[in-house]
Interface confidence: low
């Protein structure tokens, strides 16, 4: 099975080759070069020397090879690079390239999503009700939820709102939303609400919101 | 584990369609291609195509061209396969198997029966 | 496209004895730059999905049995099953991965 490696978006990944090199063979010795699951080439380093005529365009640049620990770092991460990689080690003999090694690696590219934000897109309305939005944005993979909490004194209840998604064509991030109408005809005590956003990983959870009810005004005295 | 859990078995008639799914489960769909591959009773292995699923590009068996239309849905991490202008030689078990270099997971194939 | 011919397309061999079959392509499938061929060989059994026994013509698929192995290089490949099991009884088809995908018509193998 591959290795499983993970990294985040615009960031360094590093793919390893695990070459325990037991010959104590010299990289003047070895061709090593990395490849993806469509047969693109990263990076070569034939006989110690890096090699770009082999290297793909959408890879030129973007990588560097650790001759110590073996190891391809690739730069400025983009969600379009996960996948499989395979890194493969010949010995260059006078008779011919043999394969002495070959890692594969399956690697997953995350982008942390930003901490969820309410904002109210109506004032409250009579006492009654509050249209808010919760929103957090450029993350990757999709959430998995996203909901509100509604916190008074006396009690906490969770609304599980339909999140509403996006996704950047060119960086295949997403935005995620949800809209919450809350009603509380009845609330008299202040509310603070809160915003949920819950990855494989991780649970995001906004600053508090509080709504300040204001105390209900006496009736006017009654005049005969 | 990894698993590809295909619909079930089809009986149409000559000159419909019908339209195969494949279910992946256990693994990252977007990361591997998808293969399918038919066999009709008695016969062999014949490729039919294959959907990369990440670039969004497919690759035909010339054969199959105008027959057959691979698609995926990636929010439910499953593949189609719709197959056209349904002729009793299309009565076969169609396979979908998961691939980067080579095929190592399949399906556990449909059996499409075209018959009036 | 390329053509993969195996032979041949039926096999009786005793218990415990050697089957071999051959696959031959009708263009090279040796990627000169990973010195990879992209040769895979596949085991179906009646009403069962293949299953991969061998890739890049000779690496070994977990979990497969070490009497099954792979053999050749660039238009010619073997499989070799060094000491037939009765639960070997099936259908071996040899594929390649070099230029889209083909597979051999198959090799029947049955026990003697």
């Known amino acids: 099975a591959p290795l499983k490696i993970q990294a985040y978006f615009n960031e360094t990944a590093d793919l390893p080759c695990q070459f325990a090199n037991s010959q104590n063979q010299s990289l003047s010795e070895l061709v090593v070069f990395w490849q993806d699951q469509e047969n693109l080439v990263l990076n070569e380093v034939y006989l110690g020397k890096e090699k770009f005529d082999s290297v793909h365009s959408k890879y030129m640049g973007r990588t560097s090879f650790d001759s110590d620990s073996w190891t391809l770092r690739l730069h400025n991460l983009q969600i379009k690079d996960k996948g499989l990689y395979q890194c493969i080690i010949h010995h260059k003999k006078p008779t011919g390239m043999i394969r002495i090694h070959q890692m594969n690696s399956e690697l997953s590219v995350l982008a942390n999503f930003s901490q969820p934000e309410i904002v109210p897109i109506s004032n409250i309305t009579e006492n009654v009700y509050i249209n808010l939005t919760c929103s957090s944005i450029h993350g990757y993979p999709e959430p998995k939820k996203m909901s509100v909490l509604l916190r008074t004194k006396n009690s906490t209840i969770e609304y599980d709102g339909v999140m509403q998604k996006s996704q950047d064509n060119v960086t295949e991030l997403y935005d995620v939303s949800i809209s919450l109408s809350v009603s509380f005809p009845d609330v008299t005590s202040n509310m603070t609400i809160f915003c949920i956003l819950e990855t494989d990983k991780t649970r995001l959870l906004s600053s508090p919101f509080s709504i300040e009810l204001e105390d209900p005004q006496p009736p006017p005295d009654h005049i005969p | 584990q990894v698993q590809l859990v295909q619909s079930g078995a089809e009986v149409k008639k000559p000159g419909s369609s019908v339209k195969v799914s494949c279910k992946a489960s256990?693994?990252?769909?977007?990361?591997?291609?998808i293969q399918w591959v038919r066999q009709a009773p008695g016969q062999g292995l014949e490729w039919i195509g294959v959907?990369?699923?990440?670039?969004?590009?497919?690759n035909y068996n010339q054969k199959f061209k105008g027959k057959a239309t691979m698609t995926v849905d990636k929010s439910t991490s499953t593949a189609y396969m719709e197959l056209s202008s349904l002729r009793s030689e299309d009565t076969a078990v169609y396979y979908c198997?998961?691939?980067?270099?080579?095929?190592?997971?399949w399906g556990q194939g449909t059996l499409v029966t075209v018959s009036s | 496209d390329i053509v993969l011919t195996q032979s041949p397309d039926s096999l009786a061999v005793s218990l415990g004895e050697r089957a071999t079959i051959s696959c031959k392509s009708s263009?090279?499938?040796?990627?000169?730059?990973?010195?990879?061929?992209?040769l895979a060989w596949y085991q179906q059994k009646p009403g069962q999905p293949p299953k991969l026994l061998i890739y890049?013509?000779?690496t070994r698929e977990s979990g497969v049995p070490d009497r099954f192995s792979g053999s050749g290089s660039g238009t010619d490949f073997t499989l070799t099953i060094s000491s037939l099991q009765a639960e070997d009884v099936a259908v071996y088809y040899c594929?390649?991965?070099?230029?889209?995908?083909?597979f051999g018509q198959g090799t029947k193998v049955e026990i003697k």
């Open positions: 594929t390649q991965s070099y230029n889209l995908y083909t």
């Open positions: 263009q090279s499938l040796l990627n000169s730059r990973t010195r990879e061929n992209y």
């Open positions: 256990g693994y990252t769909f977007t990361d591997y291609a």
């Open positions: 890049w013509a000779s």
């Open positions: 959907i990369n699923i990440y670039y969004d590009n497919t």
């Open positions: 198997a998961r691939a980067a270099w080579y095929m190592d997971y």
